[in-house]
């Protein structure tokens, strides 16, 4: 089920607002393994490939970029919300 | 529908620690931020601190740290707020809220637990 | 820390009139990165939880009454309701998130006449 979050967070990321949403290098995902028939539901590579992947902020999977996007706390921006706003 | 369930009224003694829970539902847990803010009776709001349950990030108003701990279980989508060394002026109404977010960023409350109340007397 | 002030104290109105309430942060609120104030407005009614009016200090909340608008840049924000009504009898709060620790002003109070 598609949240109202996640549709916010698709519409911002392909408005692209490059300060609060990060893509990793292409090569972290250049390698796709094929989609398994009958599998279900994939797991969230938030959930680990990409855990550690925002400093201050909540990492979200954006499946039409295959790629982690990061949402940031307040106080904190660039591409993995490590930078503190002055 | 979106919807935060507190729990009950408590009354404590001076110097002991309460455990306030802060049960979410309607929503993915893990996505939004689950804010303390606390209300004195005839007082202002104030902020006492915020856990993200996804990244486990938490960030503490300065007043409340090493009082105030905050935790969230992900498996109940619950979020805790233990305070201890408890005085008479921690009186007051305790709300969880969960922090939302828009344009990549969070920092507003846009829905709010009902309350609990914290009364600290000898 | 940032402070937030607001003014007035209280106010009290008649049913049908405009009123504006203001509210004034230390430092400014504006995001380089989005070019947006980090600014929310929540009304508190008695015997209540606080409920989101405003966010980014003028974007409406789903589901509010299209008389609550907010407005203002940098330091200085503005809630205004165009036409009162009863049930707008509440307590307004206005809270910066543009760095931690998150803060509120001290509210300001809205009676009808």
């Known amino acids: 089920d598609l949240q109202e979050a996640d549709l916010d967070l698709l519409r911002v990321t392909l408005s692209s607002k490059p300060q609060a949403l990060a893509t990793p290098n292409k090569e972290e995902h250049g390698k796709r393994k094929k989609k398994g028939k009958g599998l279900g539901k994939k797991r969230d590579p938030c959930l680990r490939k990409y855990k550690d992947f925002c400093i201050h902020g909540e990492c979200k999977y954006v499946k039409e970029l295959r790629a982690p996007s990061c949402i940031c706390h307040p106080g904190y921006h660039g591409e993995r919300c490590h930078g503190l706003s002055l | 529908q979106v919807q935060l369930v507190q729990s009950g009224a408590e009354v404590k003694k001076p110097g002991a620690s309460v455990k306030l829970s802060c049960k979410a539902s309607?929503?993915?847990?893990?996505?939004?931020?689950i804010t303390w803010v606390r209300q004195a009776p005839g007082q202002g709001l104030e902020w006492i601190g915020e856990?993200?349950?996804?990244?486990?990030?938490?960030y503490y108003n300065e007043k409340f740290k090493g009082r105030a701990t905050l935790t969230a279980d992900k498996s109940t989508s619950t979020a805790y707020m233990e305070l201890s060394s408890l005085r008479s002026e921690d009186t007051a109404v305790y709300f969880c809220?969960?922090?939302?977010?828009?344009?990549?960023?969070?920092?507003?409350?846009?829905?709010w637990g009902q309350g609990t109340l914290l009364t600290v007397s000898s | 820390d940032i402070v937030m002030t607001q003014s007035p104290d209280s106010l009290a109105v008649s049913v049908g009139e405009r009123v504006t309430m203001n509210c004034k942060s230390s430092q400014s609120l504006l995001y380089s990165t989005n070019q947006k104030n980090s600014l929310a407005w929540y009304q508190q009614k008695p015997g209540q939880s606080p409920k989101l009016l405003i966010y980014?200090?003028?974007t409406r909340e789903s589901g509010v009454p299209d008389r609550f608008s907010g407005s203002g840049s940098g330091t200085d924000f503005t809630l205004t309701i165009s036409s009162v009504q009863a049930e707008d009898v509440a307590v307004y709060y206005c809270?910066?998130?543009?760095?931690?620790?998150?803060?509120f002003g001290q509210g300001t109070k809205l009676e009808i006449k």
């Open positions: 809270q910066q998130y543009y760095r931690y620790p998150l803060t």
């Open positions: 980014w200090a003028s």
């Open positions: 856990i993200f349950p996804g990244s486990g990030n938490t």
């Open positions: 809220a969960r922090e939302s977010f828009s344009d990549g960023y969070y920092g507003y409350f846009d829905y």
């Open positions: 309607g929503y993915t847990f893990r996505t939004y931020g």
